[in-house]
């Protein structure tokens, strides 16, 4: 029997300060350039070394950004989302959704880290 892949979805508020290397990440997605099928959301595609996001450590590639400084990113064209970030100012508050893949083994299988009961 094969294992099943589940996802643990969590949300987090991340406050970043635009430093000398900027916020330091790239995005994909938007209503005109969907990154995920049937989802026009904005996703983190790259985190740059020495940028504010990398130094903070919480934002991850693949995270979905739900809002910037309280402004919802739903149903935005890609460029409009980019402009929102670029005009967000020095202190930037991000509401993000992390999607962690959880591998469940076959029924009856005890993983190495499981307590022996």
């Amino acid at each position: 029997m094969n294992g099943r892949v589940d996802y643990l979805v969590t949300e987090e508020e991340i406050n970043l300060t635009r430093g000398p290397s900027g916020l330091g990440f790239n995005i994909v997605g938007g209503t005109d350039q969907q990154y995920v099928s049937n989802d026009s959301g904005i996703y983190v595609s790259r985190i740059k070394e020495n940028g504010a996001a990398a130094l903070d450590g919480r934002l991850q590639e693949g995270d979905k950004i739900l809002s910037v400084n309280g402004q919802d990113l739903k149903n935005l064209l890609h460029q409009d989302a980019v402009d929102l970030f670029r005009n967000a100012g020095y202190a930037v508050s991000l509401r993000v959704q992390h999607r962690l893949q959880v591998q469940n083994g076959p029924i009856g299988h005890r993983g190495e880290g499981d307590p022996s009961g």
Partner: nanobody, 127 residues
Amino acid sequence: HVQLVESGGGLVQAGGSLRLSCAASGPSMNWYGMAWFRQSPGKERELVADVSWSGGSTYYRDSVKGRFTISRDNAKNTVYLQMNGLKPEDTAVYYCAARTSSSVDPWNYVGVGDYDYWGQGTQVTVS
């Protein structure tokens, strides 16, 4: 395999014009924009102009504003750089580049690392 091929470079007198072209071939990519960079001897490669693939947004570095125009033809997978009023300081190798995402930072933070695919370059010399 994605390929970007530049053409249109050459030798021109100050005040003259050139039109650079960059043709993209290979697998269809969900590109977010294409750009022209330039590099002169002993200097870092610098972003000259960028156009979003949707065409709704363009950027120009200050020194070329009003003289250079970037445009794209999605049907032909080609990006152009029309360069008018050329100056000797525009002399450089010009590179076409494509990006598969967008930086969230203002343009002064954007650089070589934000672009994923590169052409081989075409020489522009202004005498």
